[in-house]
């Protein structure tokens, strides 16, 4: 007996071939001997089976002795043995219909779990293997679970169902809802405008939800809500914003915030959360602001940074085109009695300059100039 595997919702074509290459009488029946379809001369006739409107054939093939049975919009319960009667012969085809569905929505938040459930006909014992977009293989029986979804799990999951040495392939598109970056850091000189961007790692037709940016300034004892906003069909509207700092927010995606001035009192860490409509849980992105200030007071040239810097970052003070006068893994460095000239304050990581502030030291009889 020939075995054919089908997918729920798909179309399957069961073949039946006569030895004579001409249109002769044929009938397709199910295992209960109920007629599905057949022919009367060159016309198609249908029986009283439950397949009625979903069964068809290709009349253009009858002249060649081919009498296919096409079943569209397959259901699990269509799994059966189908019999083609032609030329006093009976050809039997066993059809097994499988369905593979994601337990919940296919749009899942980063860190959530994905469960794939296999629907199969009674008496079948299939095995399932799924391959994620990043090439990770998972195997299972009726259910497969993947916990802690990551951004790289977004994309097409290809699942192969094996039964009777035959296989059928399912493709399921999974969208992991997350920000493109889990964390970002912005380095600015005091007084500069600060731009924070929170690009999403997915695109959907309609995006609705609400968000908030909480900020923990390094100098503050507790965190503070800087801004709350709504998102309606990708349009951003501000609900509430603090007076200090007075943040501005872009009206379109990607989410974009502007801080008019980088000041030491704003240096710190923020957490932007986005709650999407009809989703449990929130998307998070951490953002950090490091602010640098270079000053000269009397005979002391000082360079300071505020905000979350890693211990391996180096803060240096150097006269332009000269070796660093002072270089420390600290948040403040100074030079006493600095020579006249253009001094550079540099924050660097393994030789790569992250932030630079210049200050002009004038001969001792005049005041310093900050470009």
């Amino acid at each position: 007996k020939k075995v054919v595997l089908g997918k729920k919702g798909d179309t399957v074509e069961l073949t039946c071939t006569a030895s004579q290459k001409k249109s002769i009488q044929f009938h397709w029946k199910n295992s209960n001997q109920i007629k599905i379809l057949g022919n009367q001369g060159s016309f198609l006739t249908k029986g009283p089976s439950k397949l009625n409107d979903r069964a068809d054939s290709r009349r253009s093939l009858w002249d060649q002795g081919n009498f296919p049975l096409i079943i569209k919009n397959l259901k699990i319960e269509d799994s059966d043995t189908y019999i083609c009667e032609v030329e006093d012969q009976k050809e039997e085809v066993q059809l097994l219909v499988f369905g593979l569905t994601a337990n919940s929505d296919t749009h899942l938040l980063q860190g959530q779990s994905l469960t794939l459930t296999l629907e199969s006909p009674p008496g079948s014992s299939p095995s399932v293997q799924c391959r994620s977009p990043r090439g990770k293989n998972i195997q299972g029986g009726k259910t497969l679970s993947v916990s802690q979804l990551e951004l790289q799990d977004s994309g097409t999951w290809t699942c192969t169902v094996l039964q009777n040495q035959k296989k059928v392939e399912f493709k399921i598109d999974i969208v992991v809802l997350a920000f493109q970056k889990a964390s970002s850091i912005v380095y600015k000189k005091e007084g500069e405008q600060v731009e924070f961007s929170f690009p999403l790692a997915f695109t959907v037709e309609k995006l609705t939800g609400s968000g908030e940016l909480w900020w923990q300034a390094e100098r503050a004892s507790s965190s503070k809500s800087w801004i709350t906003f709504d998102l309606k069909n990708k349009e951003v509207s501000v609900k509430r914003v603090t007076q200090d700092p007075k943040l501005q927010m872009g009206k379109k995606l990607p989410l974009h915030l502007t801080l008019p001035q980088a000041l030491p009192q704003y240096a710190g860490s923020g957490n932007l959360t986005l709650a999407l409509e009809a989703k449990t849980g929130k998307l998070h992105q951490e953002v950090n602001l490091v602010v640098m200030r270079a000053t000269q007071l009397q005979k002391n040239l000082t360079c300071e940074v505020w905000g979350p810097t890693s211990p391996k970052l180096m803060l240096s003070l150097k006269l332009e085109n000269k070796e660093a006068k002072v270089s420390k893994r600290e948040k403040a460095v100074w030079v006493l009695n600095p020579e006249a000239g253009m001094w550079q304050c540099l924050l660097s990581d393994s030789g790569q300059v992250l932030l630079e502030s210049n200050i002009k030291v004038l001969p001792t009889w005049s005041t310093p100039v900050q470009p």
């Epitope: 179309t11 060159s42 016309f43 409107d53 290709r58 009349r59 253009s60 093939l61 060649q64």
Partner: antibody, heavy 120, light 107 residues
Framework: EVQLVESGGGLVQPGGSLRLSCAAS????????MSWVRQAPGKRLEWVSA????????YYPDSVKGRFTISRDNAKNTLYLQMNSLRAEDTAVYYC?????????????WGQGTLVTVSS | DIQMTQSPSSLSASVGDRVTITCQAS??????IAWYQHKPGKGPKLLIH???TLQPGIPSRFSGSGSGRDYTLTISSLQPEDFATYYC?????????FGGGTKVEIK
């Protein structure tokens, strides 16, 4: 002899409606699935709808789904295409075509076509 | 949807020439391909269906072959009445799609 004659084409404004007809003769109309196929100027042929022999099933591509409706009157041996919310890109010669038999069969006979122009 | 890529888009040939037109499907179409001849002001005419089955009344100089994704229409000896545009059609599923056409012109 199988004959298919389309009518109802013409000039219509964007957003407007038009109903095409196809008169069939020379065969038992009620035994065949029927279709409409169009060809826009300089473009390839495009199948736009199909209907089973007794109107049980109708089929459309996404490009016209919800805007076009295919129907038939087996007593009058006539096939229809109701086109609503017409767009400039619907400008084409519309052909009525007989299926070899069922919905899954190719077209074996075609009419000469009727021109539909959507323009303001 | 299944895409059909037909080549060449046009060709110039002389009476008596052997002409080959190919169609490639974006996926396996299980031999469900038909070929049509189209002349200006007329409806297309079915030449071949199911890859190689010649429609009654079509001259034997027309033949079709292929399998899987690749199919060919061959005119063994071009006749004056064969100058026309030829189209392939896939009917593997209900969303029928045509090739872009091949215009066969007189050299």
């Amino acid at each position: 002899e199988v004959q298919l004659v389309e009518s109802g084409g013409g000039l219509v404004q964007p957003g407007g409606s038009l109903r095409l007809s196809c008169a069939a003769s020379g065969f038992t109309f009620s035994n065949y699935a029927m279709s409409w196929v169009r060809q826009a100027p300089g473009k390839r042929l495009e199948w736009v709808s199909a209907i089973s022999d007794h109107s049980t099933n109708t089929y459309y591509p996404d490009s016209v789904k919800g805007r076009f409706t295919i129907s038939r009157d087996n007593a009058k041996n006539t096939l229809y295409l109701q086109m609503n919310s017409l767009r400039a890109e619907d400008t084409a010669v519309y052909y009525c075509a007989r299926k070899y038999g069922g919905a899954y069969d190719p077209f074996d006979y075609w009419g000469q076509g009727t021109l539909v122009t959507v323009s303001s | 949807d299944i895409q059909m890529t037909q080549s060449p888009s046009s060709l110039s040939a002389s009476v008596g020439d052997r002409v080959t037109i190919t169609c490639q499907a974006s996926q396996d179409i299980n031999n469900y391909i038909a070929w049509y001849q189209h002349k200006p002001g007329k409806g297309p005419k079915l030449l071949i269906h199911y890859t190689s089955t010649l429609q009654p009344g079509i001259p034997s100089r027309f033949s079709g072959s292929g399998s899987g994704r690749d199919y060919t229409l061959t005119i063994s000896s071009l006749q004056p009445e064969d100058f026309a545009t030829y189209y392939c059609l896939q009917y593997d599923n209900l969303l029928f799609t045509f090739g872009g056409g091949t215009k066969v012109e007189i050299k």
